[in-house]
Amino acid sequence: NKILVKQSPMLVAYDNAVNLSCKYSYNLFSREFRASLHKGLDSAVEVCVVYGNYSQQLQVYSKTGFNCDGKLGNESVTFYLQNLYVNQTDIYFCKIEVMYPPPYLDNEKSNGTIIHVKGKHLCPSPLFPGPSKP
């Protein structure tokens, strides 16, 4: 028995950031799971991992240097990515594994989401000074 995953076919990352929602045919509430986002047709690059342990705080990390965060819904995980580069335009696949309670479950491969990273507009208006941070 496999979990089905739905993703948007395409997203555009403006300002080098994007939110990708992975919707599952499975309720993740009170489950131990590992949700991950993979880059490339062969899913060779694991972009981000969101580890959930029942109703506790999500643990988020990337072994490949991506700046990411995750939000959990009952039947979804949304990945938030920052500081994307134009050359990271690619197809991204959601993956889900449920470790507990048994039985172990994972997903049928989804259709993926093409994330198109638009370059930052680097020409400031001459009327306004550069931004200032507190």
């Epitope: 969101v50 705080q57 999500l58 643990q59 988020v60 990390y61 990337s62 240097g65 991506f66 700046n67 990411c68 965060d69 995750g70 939000k71 959990l72 920052q82 500081n83 580069y85 550069g130 941070k133 507190p134």
Partner: antibody, heavy 120, light 107 residues
Framework: EVQLVESGGGLVQPGGSLRLSCAAF????????MHWVRQAPGKGLVWVSR????????SFADSVRGRFTISRDNAKNTLYLQLNSLRAEDTAVYYC?????????????WGQGTLVTVSS | EIVLTQSPATLSLSPGERATLSCRAS??????LAWYQQKPGQAPRLLIY???NRATGIPARFSGSGSGTDFTLTISSLEPEDFAVYYC?????????FGQGTKVEIK
Amino acid sequence: EVQLVESGGGLVQPGGSLRLSCAAFGFTFSNYWMHWVRQAPGKGLVWVSRINSDGSSASFADSVRGRFTISRDNAKNTLYLQLNSLRAEDTAVYYCARADSSSWYLFDNWGQGTLVTVSS
Amino acid sequence: EIVLTQSPATLSLSPGERATLSCRASQSVSSYLAWYQQKPGQAPRLLIYDASNRATGIPARFSGSGSGTDFTLTISSLEPEDFAVYYCQQRSNWPPTFGQGTKVEIK
């Protein structure tokens, strides 16, 4: 004026535990990601952990993952770092830092730090 | 993770002189680089973000430049309060990392 005040540091034996606190003043705490950064005596800065604005997600440096936990109480405007299974190499000044509102890992305000010494 | 290498380790200068500090990244960080100042016994303070933007309240004598792998922090004319340790930090890749610091000391 933004102010971050750490407390809870001290001397602890290897294998012991400690809980650090960071009280926040002068800004809407619940709107910001928060971080812990440490500095061993005479050494440079090393990022330790972060928590998002509502406390629902966290990340940790490899060196502390599984030993440290981060949490926050937005009602009390306070950030916490629970340090377990402490090692000599965890000896450092621990700073809490606020992330810039638009950049998760840009640290725009820092506390004065609290010293953790792990020694037998 | 990205390694940031700062040079020189120590810079001995007199007040009024120009200070040039370097930070080199092990791979491109685009313009996602910040500079912090730390005085003895004090917390770090954000000076420059996104390679060249001054943080609020930072004097104009501090300027940053560079992109990709090579970055520079310049203090055009050193004031007595500028003698401190300076750190660069990247936020391009996770985890965020800092350089080992450059100490600017009075000659």
